[in-house]
Amino acid sequence: QGGTRSPRCDCAGDFHKKIGLFCCRGCPAGHYLKAPCTEPCGNSTCLVCPQDTFLAWENHHNSECARCQACDEQASQVALENCSAVADTRCGCKPGWFVECQVSQCVSSSPFYCQPCLDCGALHRHTRLLCSRRDTDCGTCLPGFYEHGDGCVSCPTSTLGSCPERCAAVCGWRQMF
């Protein structure tokens, strides 16, 4: 007498489920359930999600749409795709910025902030990998610069001092005479 039997909805098409008193067709993506059907295998009353709300999937029981997320300006986020009735806002970083996850196990829904990409040119280095999902990967020093500690230092143009090997093209020729 527990009422554990859940009768199968024997309707044409497979997107029917018992809602209210009958098996009803669910609502399409971008619509919420206003009222269940009032006949076997009938159509539920579905309404379009209001502005700034969405439902991404076909559904039977959502009587309201989910609120669209706002991109976090404090974290320098921007909207890559605006919210629609069927999809949430897609937040990301503007060009020249990359995503820095705020948790160690990073997934698409993880909180993040945007960081400005390293400018390899300003560091006098080659750009090995352009910045997108992670920071720019800078390579070796540009011509006319040599490695010194952590940075790239401009090659000397005078012959008075020593001429580093990487700078032969700049100052080395003068030492041949």
Epitope: Q1, G3, T4, P7, K18, I19, L21, F22, C23
Partner: antibody
Framework: EVQLVESGGGLVQPGGSLRLSCAAS????????MSWVRQATGKGLEWVSA???????FYPGSVKGRFTISRENAKNSLYLQMNSLRAGDTAVYYC??????????????WGQGTLVTVSS | DIQMTQSPSSLSASVGDRVTITCRAS??????????MHWYQQKPGKAPKLLIY???NLESGVPSRFSGSGSGTDFTLTISSLQPEDFATYYC?????????FGGGTKVEIK
């Protein structure tokens, strides 16, 4: 054993209000759709309202806006709040359980009913 | 709303008789391969009791002398051999749509 026991009936003046209760036992109340059905003396049966297990309510036009069905699963109870009562609402009111094998409304257990008389 | 018309409104019969009650709906109550017609028995001062669901399915515990048939708008409840405990009023009910409606009843009396 499935049992449905109605209470709350009585004599009320036209325009008055009454709240009927139905105490359910012997089954998992929250899993079932429930209805109220009434029967005027010597007359046929008339469906009055239904409350589905997933929380939806349904009414015929004759009582919509005047009657409100509700349920309290924790108390295994079904209720019918009747407002703006008319002489035509005089009847025995039955609480009925919908069959769990059915994805359509058919009533497999009924209470013994409670009499509502609307008269001045 | 779907109107349900039962006939006859009353009948007299003897124990052992074959009894047929009909119910006509104002529009078809059949859809999606099913006929949404049900039958109840009610004895004086008692609550209704479900006999038949979906036009022809016998409810658990109901004697096999009761049977139902029909589709569309015309349905029949048959008692193959009337027993003393069968003297009662019988109602049809549809669940093809809301509101649910019942027939006016057929009273089966002892001849």
């Amino acid at each position: 054993e499935v049992q449905l026991v109605e209470s709350g009936g009585g004599l009320v003046q036209p325009g008055g209000s009454l709240r009927l209760s139905c105490a359910a036992s012997g089954f998992t109340f929250s899993n079932y759709d429930m209805s109220w059905v009434r029967q005027a003396t010597g007359k046929g049966l008339e469906w009055v309202s239904a409350f589905s297990s997933d929380g939806y309510t349904f009414y015929p036009g004759s009582v919509k806006g005047r009657f409100t069905i509700s349920r309290e699963n924790a108390k295994n109870s079904l209720y019918l709040q009747m407002n703006s009562l008319r002489a035509g609402d005089t009847a025995v009111y039955y609480c009925a359980r919908h069959a769990d094998y059915a994805n359509y409304p058919v009533m497999d257990y009924w209470g013994q009913g409670t009499l509502v008389t609307v008269s001045s | 709303d779907i109107q349900m018309t039962q006939s006859p409104s009353s009948l007299s019969a003897s124990v052992g008789d074959r009894v047929t009650i009909t119910c006509r709906a104002s529009k078809s109550v059949s859809t999606s391969g099913y006929s949404y017609m049900h039958w109840y028995q009610q004895k004086p001062g008692k609550a209704p009791k479900l006999l038949i669901y979906l036009a022809s399915n016998l409810e658990s515990g109901v004697p096999s002398r009761f049977s139902g048939s029909g589709s569309g708008t015309d349905f029949t409840l048959t008692i193959s051999s009337l027993q003393p405990e069968d003297f009662a009023t019988y109602y049809c009910q549809h669940s093809r749509e809301l509101p649910l409606t019942f027939g006016g009843g057929t009273k089966v009396e002892i001849k």
